[in-house]
C-alpha cells in the first residue's frame, strides 16, 4: 500500500521556518498521518481505507493552507523527489532507483514513451502485481493516463459478474473494463480520475476528480473521490461516491432493489444511479429509450445511452 | 488462419471423466479479450454451451453442468482441456471447442467436433 | 438464464426466395445476439454478430436486425447452399445460450 506521494501535506511538513499556529497544528495532523501510513504496511488490507479517508480529510485541511506555501514549493519539491526516490527504492527491495520503476502509464511517459497504446507493465513482486496489458493514453490533458475503462464498440457486454469486473474483461485494444483488482493496485498511490464522453451528436465532455482510490476486494472495491472539475455539467459520480461495487451476483448497493440486476452492470450502485458508465451499450435509435443504458444524468439524463466514454488515471503528482 | 482441433476418447462409460483436448493455431491465448469456449450437440439436438476461458484464466461455465465440468488453458502449448466428470449417455454428444474473439462473446472459428458416445 | 426461441422450427423454401426467421430472447438483450449456420455433419459456421454485422466472408445476402428481445434473419435470395440449420445465439450474459435452430429445407 503505496500513499506516500501526498503532495501537499508533504510541503507544510518540510517548512520549517514561519511557524505559525496553523502551520504547526498542520505539521501535527501529518505527523499523524505519517505514523497512520508507516503502521498500514504492518496492517492488513482491512484498516486501508479508512487511512484514505483520513488522508483525504487531511487534503481537504492542507488545501486551505496552499496559498501560504506557494512561495516554498519549488525548494520542497526537489527535495519530496528524493524522498520518493528512497521510498520506491525501499519498495522496490532491490537496488535500482524508482525512475527505473514502472507502475503505470505515466511512469511510461517519464521514460519518454510518448506514443498512445497498448503496453506491458512488468510484475512488481513486492505489491503481488503480475504483468499487466494496459492502454496508454499520452495525449489527452498532458498524456501519462492508463485507461481502466472504454466502451465505444458495444461489442463486450459489460453485464458480467463479480469475478469477471474483478480480473478485468474485453480487449484493452477495443471494449474493456481493466479489473478491480487491477484498478485498486493502481491507486494506491494518490491518483486522478479523468472520464471522457461523447454523445451521438459528437459532442465530447469530461470530468475530473482530484483524487481517486478504489479500496480492495474486503471493501468491496468502494469508491472513494475527491473533488470534481469539468464540462459535463452536474457531477454524476459524487451520488456514487464511499458506495461499494456491485454485480449482478454481488448486491453491495444501498438499496432494496438488486441494481446491478436493474440497471445491467457492475458499478458503484448507490440507490441505483446517477451515473452508469458500465450500462449497456445502446447503438443509434435505441440509444434514448432506455434506463439501463451508458448514462451520466448530469448531461443528457437518465434515458440517453452515450456512444463513447472512457474512465482513466494517472497519479495526482504527474508533471508532463 | 485460425485453426482449431478436438481430441480424445470417441466411447466412455458411465460414470468415467471425460477428458477433451482443444489444439489451436492462429492465434495466441494471451491476446487480452481472446477465449476458448465448448458447445456439445447431442444428435439431432441444438446446441449448447458448456464453458469459456479466457486470456487472464477467466472460467465460464454452464450453471447446470458446473459441477462436473473444469475448463484449463496451456498458453506455451496452445491448449485447452476440457473435463466432464460422472458421464451419462446422455452426455453423448458432438463436442466442438471454438475460438471467442476479443470484441464480444460469439464463435467465429469452430473445431470440427468430436463424436463422444457414453455407453456401457 | 436468458431463453431463446427460434421461429419457425422448420421452414421448406425456393432458390432466390425470400427467407426470414426469427428469434426471441426471453429478456432484453440489446444487440447481443448472433447467428450461425450449420450444414449436416459439419460445425456451425457464424454469420452474423451484434445483431446486424456481417461476418468476414459471408455473402451480402445474409442480413440481421433487431435489439431488444426480437431478432431477425434475413436471406434476400435463397442459395442451393443455404439450405442448412441456423441458430442464433445470445452474448448479453453468461450462460450463452443458443436458440432451438430453424432448420430450411428446400420446398
Known amino acids: 500500500q503505496k500513499l506516500s506521494k501526498h503532495k501537499t501535506p508533504a510541503q507544510p511538513q518540510l517548512k520549517a521556518a514561519n511557524c505559525c499556529e496553523e502551520v504547526k497544528e498542520l505539521k501535527a495532523q501529518v505527523a499523524n498521518l505519517s505514523s497512520l501510513l508507516s503502521e498500514l504496511n504492518k496492517k492488513q488490507e482491512r484498516d486501508w481505507v479508512s487511512v484514505v479517508m483520513q488522508v483525504m480529510e487531511l487534503e481537504s485541511n492542507s488545501k486551505r493552507m496552499e496559498s501560504r506555501l506557494t512561495d516554498a514549493e519549488s525548494k520542497y519539491s526537489e527535495m519530496n523527489n528524493q524522498i520518493d526516490i528512497m521510498q520506491l527504492q525501499a519498495a522496490q527491495t532491490v537496488t535500482q532507483t524508482s525512475a527505473d520503476a514502472i507502475y503505470d502509464c505515466s511512469s511510461l511517459y517519464q521514460k519518454n514513451y510518448r506514443i498512445s497504446g497498448v503496453y506491458k507493465l512488468p510484475p512488481d513482486d513486492f505489491l503481488g502485481s503480475p504483468e499487466l496489458e494496459v492502454f496508454c493514453d499520452m495525449e489527452t490533458s498532458g498524456g501519462g493516463w492508463t485507461i481502466i475503462q472504454r466502451r465505444k464498440s458495444g461489442l463486450v457486454s459489460f453485464y458480467r459478474d463479480w469475478k469477471q469486473y474483478k480480473q478485468g474483461f474485453g480487449s484493452i485494444r477495443g471494449d474493456f473494463w481493466l479489473g478491480n483488482e487491477h484498478i485498486h493496485r493502481l491507486s494506491r498511490q494518490p491518483t486522478r480520475l479523468r472520464v471522457e464522453m461523447e454523445d451521438w451528436e459528437g459532442n465530447l465532455r469530461y470530468a475530473e476528480y482530484s483524487h481517486f482510490v478504489l479500496g480492495n476486494e474486503l471493501n468491496s472495491y468502494r469508491l472513494f473521490l475527491g473533488n470534481y472539475t469539468g464540462n459535463v455539467g452536474n457531477d454524476a459520480l459524487q451520488y456514487h461516491n464511499n458506495t461499494a461495487f456491485s454485480t449482478k451476483d454481488k448486491d453491495n448497493d444501498n438499496c432494496l432493489d438488486k441494481c446491478a440486476q436493474l440497471r445491467k452492470g457492475g458499478y458503484w450502485y448507490n440507490c441505483c444511479t446517477d451515473s452508469n458508465l458500465n450500462g449497456v451499450y445502446y447503438r443509434l435509435g435505441e440509444h434514448n429509450k432506455h434506463l439501463d443504458g451508458i448514462t451520466w444524468y448530469g448531461w443528457h439524463g437518465s434515458t440517453y445511452s452515450l456512444k463513447r466514454v472512457e474512465m482513466k488515471i494517472r497519479p495526482e503528482d504527474f508533471k508532463p | 488462419q485460425i485453426t482449431l482441433k478436438e481430441s480424445g476418447p470417441t466411447l466412455v462409460k458411465p460414470t468415467q471423466t471425460l477428458t477433451l483436448t482443444c489444439t489451436f493455431s492462429g492465434f495466441s491465448l494471451s491476446t487480452s479479450g481472446v477465449g476458448v469456449g465448448w458447445i456439445r450437440q447431442p444428435p439431432g439436438k441444438a446446441l449448447e454451451w458448456l464453458a469459456l476461458i479466457y486470456w487472464n484464466d477467466d472460467k465460464q461455465y454452464s450453471p447446470s453442468l458446473k459441477s462436473r465440468l473444469t475448463i484449463t488453458k496451456d498458453t506455451s502449448k496452445n491448449q485447452v482441456v476440457l473435463t466432464m466428470t460422472n458421464m451419462d449417455p446422455m452426455d453423448t454428444a458432438t463436442y466442438y471447442c471454438?475460438?471467442?474473439?476479443?470484441?464480444?462473446?460469439?464463435?467465429?472459428?469452430w473445431g470440427q467436433g468430436t463424436l463422444v458416445t457414453v455407453s456401457s | 438464464d436468458i431463453q431463446m426461441t427460434q421461429s419457425p422450427s422448420s421452414l421448406s423454401a425456393s432458390v432466390g426466395d425470400r427467407v426470414t426467421i426469427t428469434c426471441r430472447a426471453s429478456?432484453?438483450?440489446?444487440?447481443?445476439l448472433n447467428w450461425y449456420q450449420q450444414k449436416p455433419g459439419k460445425a456451425p459456421k457464424l454469420l452474423i454478430y451484434a445483431a446486424s454485422s456481417l461476418q468476414s466472408g459471408v455473402p451480402s445476402r445474409f442480413s440481421g436486425s433487431g435489439s431488444g428481445t426480437d431478432f431477425i434473419l434475413t436471406i434476400s435470395s435463397l442459395q442451393p447452399e443455404d439450405f442448412a440449420t441456423y441458430y442464433c445465439q445470445q452474448s448479453f450474459s453468461t450462460p450463452l445460450t443458443f436458440g432451438g435452430g430453424t432448420k430450411l429445407e428446400i420446398k
Open positions: 471454438a475460438h471467442n474473439p476479443d470484441y464480444g462473446d460469439f464463435f467465429d472459428y
Open positions: 429478456q432484453s438483450i440489446s444487440s447481443y
